[in-house]
């Protein structure tokens, strides 16, 4: 469930901190009810290029655990389309504490409203 | 050449437990995630259990859950399968299966083991 | 679950001819990122699975290109454009982008 997908952003969040990773990421800061799959779809993304950034195993792994779990349960809740929202690229690009803080806001948001 | 060599099958009572290895050769294994898939005899295949590479994250169907467990030591190059509470059903030949990364090249299972097979039988 | 349900379930094919599998997924397999994880895996007479087709369409190495994958969505198909007689054997669609993953039943080819 999203408590997992948090606590797994707690674990990278804990993780890069002993790493110099200096990439910016394409961040949604103030998602909209209405575009929050097609931000969480965005804040997948890029963790994947946390992952590459980084090298480490247990980021990695973290990384695709996150995914699977992120896609066992937007799929249980049906196809969800999305119009009107904001492609990545045009998001802006923070610092990944700021990036991280945001991811979990927006997984909070799921878990308010399931 | 990437060598998967799985053993440790044999006949086993049901309710009893039995552990499955499969040794790596020929590739670093503690890059790869790693699965194991069972073939019952004359029927088609069905996964039974994947692990991360690091060994934190596991996965199973139903059908197996609680009661199959996938580990791995990645000292010794080793994939491991502790199966308990069997059943007639689990009766199969069991393969084991390097998996590459979702992040670096899209999930699938791309060799195999020879397979090893589990009669469960009293 | 997703249930991946392939036919036909039996092939019989003339040498040199082509042949065609299709694999139907219960829902769609796109998964969040936009990665659609489906495979097909051939199963000689006798021998372990083999990697033919990674993510729709993409051979693995090794793979003659006579084998193809196709398809979006719900719906997939591995297509040989002229089947050898090394090609008997079972084929199988495999679906891994939500958990628990799954094969399809299998398509058994052989030689008419």
């Known amino acids: 469930n999203w408590v997992n997908v948090i606590s797994d952003l707690k674990k990278i969040e804990d993780l890069i901190q002993s790493m110099h990773i200096d990439a910016t990421l394409y961040t949604e800061s103030d998602v909209h009810p209405s575009c929050k799959v097609t931000a969480m779809k965005c804040f997948l993304l890029e963790l994947q290029v946390i992952s590459h950034e980084s090298g480490d195993t247990d980021i990695h792994d973290t990384v695709e655990n996150l995914i699977i779990l992120a896609n066992n349960i937007l799929s249980s809740n049906g196809n969800i389309t999305e119009s009107g929202c904001k492609e990545c690229e045009e998001l802006e690009e923070k610092n990944i504490k700021e990036f991280l803080q945001s991811f979990v806001h927006i997984v909070q948001m799921f878990i308010n409203t399931s | 050449e990437v060598r998967l060599m799985a053993s440790g099958g044999g006949l086993v009572q049901p309710g009893g437990s039995l552990r499955l290895s499969c040794a790596a050769s020929e590739f670093t294994f503690s890059n790869y995630a790693m699965s194991w898939v069972r073939q019952a005899p004359g029927k088609g295949l069905e996964w039974v259990a994947t692990?991360?590479?690091?060994?934190?994250?596991?996965y199973y169907p139903d059908s197996v859950k609680g009661r199959f467990t996938i580990s791995r030591d990645n000292s010794k190059n080793t994939l491991y399968l502790q199966m308990n509470s069997l059943r007639a059903e689990d009766t199969a030949v069991y393969y084991c299966?390097?998996?590459?990364?979702?992040?670096?090249?899209?999930?699938?299972?791309?060799?195999w083991g020879q397979g090893t097979l589990v009669t469960v039988s009293s | 679950d997703v249930v991946m349900t392939q036919s036909p379930l039996s092939l019989p094919v003339t040498l040199g001819q082509p042949a065609s599998i299709s694999c139907r997924s219960s829902q769609s397999i796109v998964d969040i990122t936009g990665n659609t994880y489906l495979e097909w895996y051939q199963q000689r007479p006798g021998q372990s699975p083999r990697l033919l087709i990674y993510?729709?369409?993409n051979r693995f190495s090794g793979v003659p290109d006579r084998f193809s994958g196709s398809g979006s969505g719900t719906d997939f198909t591995l297509k040989i454009s002229r089947v050898e007689a090394e090609d008997v054997g079972v084929y199988y669609c495999?679906?891994?982008?939500?958990?628990?993953?799954?094969f399809g039943q299998g398509t058994k080819l052989e030689i008419k």
């Open positions: 993510k729709v369409f």
């Open positions: 692990i991360s590479r690091g060994g934190d994250y596991t």
């Open positions: 299966a390097r998996r590459v990364s979702m992040i670096t090249g899209g999930w699938a299972m791309d060799y």
């Open positions: 495999f679906q891994d982008s939500f958990v628990p993953y799954t």
